[in-house]
């Protein structure tokens, strides 16, 4: 039981994780490094001409559960992988485009490394 006056709200996690960012660098990033309370990610997408586009950055803790889970999008391909184990861990993530199947791709698992 909490003592009277003791806060039940969790204390905010400090921004402890640094990630490489490319195309998704916030305004305050320096040397292509961003900081987050959540996850680092690397993402691969297919552009209109079918070429792969690889980008990376930081994800806040809030909402990262669904960001780090491959959610289908129509008529195009996209895959994302997330990690937290060390600073700049997303340098070592290498997501691959999912196979084309029935115009969109099959639900994927949550990708954490």
């Amino acid at each position: 039981k909490k003592e009277d006056g003791e806060s039940t709200a969790p204390t905010p996690r400090p921004k402890v994780l640094r990630c490489k960012c490319h195309h998704h660098c916030p305004e305050d990033s320096v040397n292509n490094i961003c900081s987050t309370d959540g996850y680092c990610f690397t993402m691969i997408e297919e552009d209109d001409s079918g070429l792969p586009v690889v980008t990376s950055g930081c994800l806040g803790l809030e909402g990262s559960d669904f960001q780090c889970r491959d959610t289908p999008i129509p008529h195009q391909r996209r895959s994302i992988e997330c990690c937290t184990e060390r600073n700049e861990c997303n340098k070592d993530l290498h997501p691959t485009l999912p196979p084309l199947k029935n115009r969109d791709f099959v639900d994927g698992p949550i990708h954490h490394r």
Epitope: E45, G57, P72, P74, Q76
Partner: antibody, heavy 124, light 107 residues
Framework: QVQLVQSGAEVKKPGASVKVSCKAS????????MHWVRQAPGQGLEWMGM????????NYNENFKSRVTMTRDTSTSTVYMELSSLRSEDTAVYYC?????????????????WGQGTLVTVSS | DIQMTQSPSSLSASVGDRVTITCRAS??????LNWYQQKPGKAPKLLIY???RLHSGVPSRFSGSGSGTDFTLTISSLQPEDFATYYC?????????FGGGTKVEIK
């Protein structure tokens, strides 16, 4: 937390233009598509188009294509929707809505976070 | 454009009731169907995306199902805060289109 704050209500004459702003905070502005959706009084929702703040790439609903322009200012994390040649049927609440998924080039269709809405009244 | 048809357009229900709303697309939209809740004077809120995935913070009494052209939103046990208007939206093909809405009122 994600916040989208829109500009205030506007009253316009038929034939005029209106420019509605949507200032984003609480996330990396350049990483998500921003959509614009409108709702006439007592009516349903109508998707107007979308803009990617990083590239400035846009997709417009053909119903508005000749009259709508969506722009962004990355220095202030703000997107804008301008509608020209206004008519009485354009009287509506205009919403910006951020997409759910991070995207760079692919188009994503999930309207996860919404602004509070801007009422535009067109009346002579 | 893909037409989205919701039924019923309105319904009356009591707290604790199981409520089902249907949405039909004029052509196959795979599973790219989202549901939104809107209360008077407020912006819509995303409830369910990609047919059945709950958005962050949405109570588990909301669920979605379907595929192709026919979709369903179910509220397993209606709560006082669930009285609102619900819209479906297809995300398969541009332009994205919404259903006409279903107003859930207190019986």
């Amino acid at each position: 937390q994600v916040q989208l704050v829109q500009s205030g209500a506007e009253v316009k004459k038929p034939g005029a233009s209106v420019k509605v702003s949507c200032k984003a905070s609480g996330y990396t502005f350049i990483s998500y598509w921003m959509h614009w959706v409108r709702q006439a009084p007592g009516q349903g929702l109508e998707w107007m188009g979308m803009i990617h703040p990083n590239s400035g790439s846009t997709n417009y609903n053909e119903n508005f294509k000749s009259r709508v322009t969506m722009t962004r200012d990355t220095s202030t994390s703000t997107v804008y929707m301008e509608l020209s040649s206004l008519r009485s049927e354009d009287t509506a609440v205009y919403y910006c809505a951020r997409d759910l998924l991070i995207a760079t080039v692919v188009v994503t269709p999930y309207f996860a976070y919404w602004g509070q809405g801007t009422l535009v009244t067109v009346s002579s | 454009d893909i037409q989205m048809t919701q039924s019923p357009s309105s319904l009356s229900a009591s707290v604790g009731d199981r409520v089902t709303i249907t949405c039909r697309a004029s052509q196959d939209i795979s599973n790219f169907l989202n549901w939104y809740q809107q209360k008077p004077g407020k912006a819509p809120k995303l409830l369910i995306y990609y047919t059945s995935r709950l958005h962050s913070g949405v109570p588990s009494r909301f669920s979605g199902s379907g595929s192709g052209t026919d979709f369903t939103l179910t509220i397993s046990s209606l709560q006082p805060e669930d009285f609102a208007t619900y819209y479906c939206q297809q995300g398969n093909t541009l332009p994205y289109t919404f259903g006409g809405g279903t107003k859930v009122e207190i019986k």
